[in-house]
């Protein structure tokens, strides 16, 4: 029951996370015009991964796509790539995890197959979340660098008379959506991996043992795992004295660190 709940929750959390990553990738507000300590303008600028927008005070909004590939900064291209990789991996992970769900019965799929699929989707979710977090963090770092560069020469006097105001950009809503979504996908992936451990059938090393009852000579053999229905816990075939002890080699380890570029 706990395994099913963990797997189900992991799936839902990952689903929300991937939806968030898709939303963040599509959003226009990755960077927004910094209004703090800035002359008040009747125009508000904001930029996304795919286009930049200008909203006038009247409400009129005009967006222009980045119709060039080669002319775009390498960092922006890298962020785009990371977000797309995150979405693709997440989508594949979702597809795999649907079939891996313990509550869904597909043919005569064994628990071992479901465990492997759960682990695969979990790893995919973890990598997807890391891609999103890395992409958003790279963009945020780029913004911070540009912000302080533009602050250094915000007002450049021209002949002491005319002033040109440089538009500074700060974190947009999409960054926060991306960070949260990436985190959720990561958490969902970890939950799937934890659920995988509970799903995985453990090989019994019992040999066939003959039990002699008085008056009868019947041999009982422990049944194989193939008898499992896929629903509930098959107590007949489980080792009773496990104690949770595992060797270090048995414990699956996953990458938990990532670099903020």
């Amino acid at each position: 029951m706990a395994v099913t709940a963990c797997q189900g929750l992991g799936f839902v959390v990952s689903l929300i996370g991937i939806a968030g990553i898709i939303a963040a990738t599509c959003m226009d507000q990755w960077s927004t015009q910094d209004l703090y300590n800035n002359p008040v303008t009747a125009v508000f600028n904001y930029q996304g991964l795919w286009r930049s927008c200008v909203r006038e005070s009247s409400g009129f909004t005009e967006c222009r796509g980045y119709f060039t590939l080669l002319g775009l900064p390498a960092m922006l291209q890298a962020v785009r790539a990371l977000m797309i990789v995150g979405i693709v991996l997440g989508a594949i992970g979702l597809l795999v995890s649907i079939f891996a769900l313990k509550c869904i019965r597909i043919g005569s799929m064994e628990d071992s197959a479901k465990a492997n699929m759960t682990l695969t989707s979990g790893i995919m979710f973890i990598v997807s979340g890391l891609c999103a977090i890395a992409g958003v963090s790279v963009f945020a770092n780029m913004l911070v660098t540009n912000f302080w560069m533009s602050t250094a020469n915000m007002y450049t006097g021209m002949g002491g008379m005319v002033q040109t105001v440089q538009t500074r950009y700060t974190f947009g809503a999409a960054l926060f959506v991306g960070w949260v979504a990436g985190g959720l996908t990561l958490i969902g992936g970890v939950m799937m991996c934890i659920a995988c451990r509970g799903l995985a059938p453990e090989e019994t090393n019992y040999k066939a043992v003959s039990y002699h009852a008085s008056g009868h000579s019947v041999a009982y053999k422990p049944g194989g795992f193939k008898a499992s229905t896929g629903f509930g816990s098959n107590t007949k075939n489980k080792k009773i004295y496990d104690g949770g002890a595992r060797t270090e080699d048995e414990v699956q380890s996953y990458p938990s660190k990532h670099d903020y570029v």
Epitope: A42, N45, Q47, S58, F60, E62, T167
Partner: antibody, heavy 118, light 113 residues
């Protein structure tokens, strides 16, 4: 047909208050912003204030402490409350619709004359 | 506040001849986001309310004769009348539509010689 009709102007003593009205027709105040602009006799145009479709306001910093822009959406009417009036506030006051493009002013009223005199 | 400086103050022109009005702003009116200049030109005929001729520095208002054209970018702008007609007599104003408070130029009076 977009139309703006100002009213409420007249002769007022210095230090007194006056409220100007601007009745808008042909468009909604919740869709378009409206500006107040004034013109002293024989002088140029001076921007006073604006209330945008969303309700946010901006003022000429020199007049902000004395003038307040507001609107009544149900009546589709704009107001300019002018307090502590001075002789230099004598002018024709125009209300003008904020254009959807370019932040300009595309339709203007005929104006109402405000004379501040003792 | 952004200061808008218009020149000349008065412009006597011959009918059918071109006319040019200059407007300079103390800060750039060019928005980097859309590369548009937030400068508006108005015409005020004697005894009338102003009317918008040009917005975004060079986009003509619908219904405005195409003899009126706007140009310039950043801080220097120009309004040109290709062939002045009698109905063009009046005062022309440029307006900063980028920074609050919106400010107008002092005006240029166009009159027939």
């Amino acid at each position: 047909q977009v139309q703006l009709v100002e009213s409420g102007g007249g002769v007022v003593q210095p230090g007194r208050s006056l409220r100007l009205s601007c009745a808008a027709s042909g468009f909604s105040l919740t869709t378009y912003g409206v500006h107040w602009v004034r013109q002293a006799p024989g002088k140029g145009l001076e921007w006073v204030a604006v209330i945008w479709a969303g309700g946010s306001t901006n003022y000429n910093s020199a007049l902000m402490s004395r003038f307040t822009i507001s609107r009544d959406n149900s009546k589709n009417t704009l107001y300019l409350q002018m307090n502590s009036l001075r002789a230099e506030d004598t002018a024709v006051y125009y209300c003008a619709r904020a254009a959807y493009y370019g932040n300009g002013l595309d339709y203007w009223g005929q104006g109402t004359m405000v004379t501040v005199s003792s | 506040d952004v200061v808008m400086t218009q020149s000349p103050l008065s412009l006597p022109v011959t009918l059918g001849q071109p006319a040019s009005i200059s407007c300079k702003s103390s800060q750039t009116l060019l928005n980097s986001g859309n590369q548009k200049n937030y400068l508006t030109w108005f015409q005020q005929r004697p005894g009338q309310s102003p009317r918008r001729l040009i917005y975004w520095a060079s986009t003509g208002e619908s219904g405005v004769p195409d003899r009126f054209s706007g140009s310039g970018s950043g801080t220097d702008f120009t309004l040109k009348i290709s062939r002045v007609e009698a109905e063009d007599v009046g005062v022309y104003y440029c307006q900063n539509a980028y920074f609050y408070p919106f400010t107008f130029g002092g005006g240029t009076k166009v009159e027939i010689k």
